[in-house]
């Protein structure tokens, strides 16, 4: 069961796995959630009744019964990990901790104007986990405005002490705010010969790369495949680092693969979710349970629903015994990875999907694209919404995209003449406008946030957020789309689609069925040539065929320009403006979403 509230003056007795230091109970809960085995924790706050050496300790705990006896203790705060919860979770921590010195290895010291600048430096430094900044009121003159970048083996401080006039905080890499280069290449037949910080077993290089990404010290990895000559090293995933952050030596070796941590590509790719099945593969580990199951998919479900299960092996039924049910072995280990991987025994193995909620919901797989037709099918564009106005009569006003469970991203120009959010209704999971009846459920709009530099669509800043009155429960037919990551600014998207219920030609009517068109992106320079009388800025992006024929049109405004990259859909553009519809040499102009990611995060994460 999911318990989110913290228990004040309460300590859980026993079950200790390890102790770390965190600046708050809230962050202790996050650390527990991300730890492979932690189910409960006890945090000690600062208190005159407590020994200062125990302040800020976060004891991570496990229990076979998923609970532990409670004891009253002043200054102790206890709680449960979010593993037991179905809601989305994130390691992103933007809090700044005043008068706290978070200890670690101080590997870089420089002058900074503010704590924010120091945090940005930490976020853009490959090794930095957290920082401490001495403010201009700091007693020691020569230390004022000094920004100390720090790292540790665990990514959490080795100790936390009270220190006046300093502030501390964490890198925002896990908030997808790093400008560090995102290197997605996996290099075949390559070994990176740098120091290993850890090693785990993995079924393939992709899982190895994801493990590297969420390991605090790993910057790159080498994976030995199952064909690697040295048997004892097969399926071994070596997690590596170096002083420069880059591999210093690269050796050509057959049957090895190497790659990089994807920490700077964070929000656009799944990092925790290992959803594949591995056939003729057995994962070894501590056995949690053996259950009968009809299929390997059913076995994965059982593992996902058992909070302590980390991975499984399914052995299919022999002939007709046990009603055609096979054996599902639910397993765990100290680090969440199999202790050994064996091949050729007929098992089918995989991982719990419980960790998928640690990834952005938008990265999870959706229905495959239906190629060819212009009409969409249900669930094909689950982030697409239809925004209706009820005044003077109810009608489709604009498109929009779900980007969070309470947020729709759309165009600012949609709200010309809209006096109040009360007249707006957002319908999600809709394929045909005719489905919308009097009793069709909708989301009311609590707030319309229009970019404060918006004047008119053609001059840019054509972007708006709608805050919904209630939250969207994600299903196959309504789920978010990923925002492009700042680290992906240079990705060249080749699979882009515009969708909407808008006109199919300039003088037309709103379509009943959601329409789709695959449209190539056009460089801003090319676009500028087509719109001599306008300024095409870098905050705009253009798409269209030279010969015309496919384009967004009236009624599609505010809807998405969705591009698929590395199997994940990104909201690259918001339908904004254009000259006519689908005219020759007149591409559609879209709001370039990547340029507004900071604005979106600022507005959606404001307290």
């Amino acid at each position: 069961e999911c318990v989110t509230q913290l228990l004040k003056d309460t300590c859980f007795e026993g079950g200790d796995i390890t102790t770390v230091f965190t600046p708050s109970a809230k962050y202790c809960q996050v650390v527990c959630t991300y730890h492979p085995r932690c189910l409960l924790f006890t945090f000690t706050a600062e208190s005159p009744s407590e020994d200062p050496t125990r302040w800020f300790t976060c004891v991570l705990k496990d229990s076979v019964t998923e609970t532990l006896p409670r004891v009253n203790r002043t200054a102790a705060i206890s709680g449960y990990s979010f593993k037991q919860c179905s809601h989305q979770i994130s390691a992103c921590n933007k809090d700044i901790y005043v008068d706290l010195d978070m200890k670690g290895i101080n590997y870089n010291s420089s002058v900074a104007k503010s704590a924010q600048e120091c945090q940005e430096r930490c976020t853009d430094d490959v090794h930095c986990h957290f920082f401490t900044y001495a403010t201009r009121q700091f007693p020691s003159l020569e230390h004022r405005n000094i920004c100390l970048l720090k790292h540790t083996q665990t990514g959490t401080p080795t100790r936390i002490t009270k220190l006046d006039k300093v502030v501390s905080g964490f890198s925002l890499k896990s908030c997808a705010l790093s400008n560090l280069a995102c290197i997605r290449d996996i290099f075949p037949n390559t070994v990176f010969a740098d120091s290993n910080i850890d090693s785990v077993m993995a079924p393939d290089a992709f899982v190895c790369g994801r493990i590297c990404t969420h390991h605090p010290g790993c910057l790159f990895f080498t994976f030995f495949s199952q064909e690697w000559p040295k048997e004892s090293q097969r399926n071994l995933c070596l997690l590596k680092t170096s002083e420069s952050g880059l591999p210093s030596t690269r050796i050509k070796k057959s049957k090895a693969l190497s790659g990089f941590s994807l920490q700077s590509c964070r929000h656009s790719i799944p990092v925790f979710c290992h959803s594949s099945f591995y056939h003729d593969t057995d994962f070894l580990g501590e056995e949690l349970d053996i259950v009968a199951a009809k299929s390997h998919e059913a076995c994965q479900k059982l593992c996902t629903n058992a909070v302590r299960c980390q991975f499984f092996t399914y052995t299919p039924a022999q002939a007709s015994c046990n009603e055609g049910k096979g054996k599902c072995y639910l397993k765990l280990s100290s680090n969440g990875s199999p202790t050994k991987i064996l091949h050729g025994r007929g098992g089918i193995s995989g991982y719990t999907l419980r960790l998928c909620k640690m990834d952005n919901e938008c990265t999870t797989k959706i229905k495959p694209r239906i190629v060819g037709g212009t009409a969409s099918v249900r669930g094909e564009w689950p982030w697409q919404v239809t925004l209706h106005t009820t005044s003077p009569t109810q009608r489709h006003l604009c498109g929009g995209s779900i980007i969070g469970n309470q947020w729709i991203l759309t165009a600012a120009h949609c709200f010309y003449g809209v006096e109040s959010p009360k007249i707006l209704r957002v319908y999600s999971g809709i394929l045909n406008q005719s489905e919308i009846k009097e009793d069709t459920s909708f989301f009311g709009v609590q707030e319309i946030i229009i970019h404060d530099q918006y004047k008119m669509a053609e001059s840019g800043y054509d972007i708006a957020l709608l805050k919904l009155e209630t939250t969207v429960n994600y299903t196959d037919s309504q789920r978010p789309i990923c925002l492009p990551s700042k680290g992906d600014r240079n990705v060249i998207y080749t699979d882009c689609w515009v969708t909407g219920w808008g006109y199919r030609k300039l003088r037309d009517k709103i379509q009943n069925t959601l329409q789709k068109a695959k449209i190539p992106l056009v460089t801003n320079e090319e676009c500028q040539k087509r719109y001599r009388g306008h300024k095409i800025t870098h905050k705009m992006i253009c798409a269209g065929y030279r010969e015309g024929g496919k384009d967004a049109c009236k009624g599609d405004s505010g809807g998405p320009l969705s591009c698929k990259h590395n199997e994940v859909w990104h909201l690259v553009g918001i339908t904004s403006w254009g000259e006519g519809c689908a005219q020759r040499e007149r591409p559609g102009v879209y709001t370039n979403v990547v340029e507004y990611v900071d604005w979106i995060l600022e507005k959606t994460q404001a307290v």
């Epitope: 853009d124 490959v126 790093s178 400008n179 560090l180 280069a181 995102c182 290197i183 997605r184 290449d185 290099f187 910057l219 420069s244 952050g245 880059l246 591999p247 210093s248 690269r250 240079n490």
Partner: nanobody
Framework: QVQLVESGGGSVQAGGSLRLSCAAS????????VGWFRQAPGKGLEGVSA????????YYADSVKGRFTISRDNSKNTLYLQMNSLKPEDTAVYYC?????????????????WGQGTLVTVSS
């Protein structure tokens, strides 16, 4: 001693092309971030393009995307910048730079080694 030497600058009409080269000695492009930066008269340094030479991942400033192409020849330890459809606003001194750490690719503050620069003048 590390030396980066740029060449290929010059004067060109708007719409024309130039190819800049940067030859390195004492520093290997292979397995590092290398990039081109520019400084227009009276302006600050601006990141133009960068490449991670191991895999060839490339990065471009929005103002040059689609017009400029960065490439490198690891065997010759040389970096190139092919500049097409040049505009008057591309007029600047172009510098080649090499990093020795994993960096934000277009952030000049994080690059260690720099060339002397080559002047590119685009007239309308």
């Amino acid at each position: 001693q590390v030396q980066l030497v740029e060449s290929g600058g010059g004067s060109v009409q708007a719409g024309g092309s130039l190819r800049l080269s940067c030859a390195a000695s004492g520093y290997t492009f292979n397995n590092n971030f290398v990039g081109w930066f520019r400084q227009a008269p009276g302006k600050g340094l601006e990141g133009v393009s960068a490449i991670y030479s191991l895999g060839g991942s490339t990065y471009y400033a929005d103002s040059v995307k689609g017009r400029f192409t960065i490439s490198r020849d690891n065997s010759k330890n040389t970096l190139y910048l092919q500049m097409n459809s040049l505009k008057p606003e591309d007029t600047a001194v172009y510098y080649c730079a090499g990093a020795i750490t994993w960096v934000p690719p277009l952030s000049h503050r994080r690059y260690t080694y720099w060339g002397q620069g080559t002047l590119v003048t685009v007239s309308s």
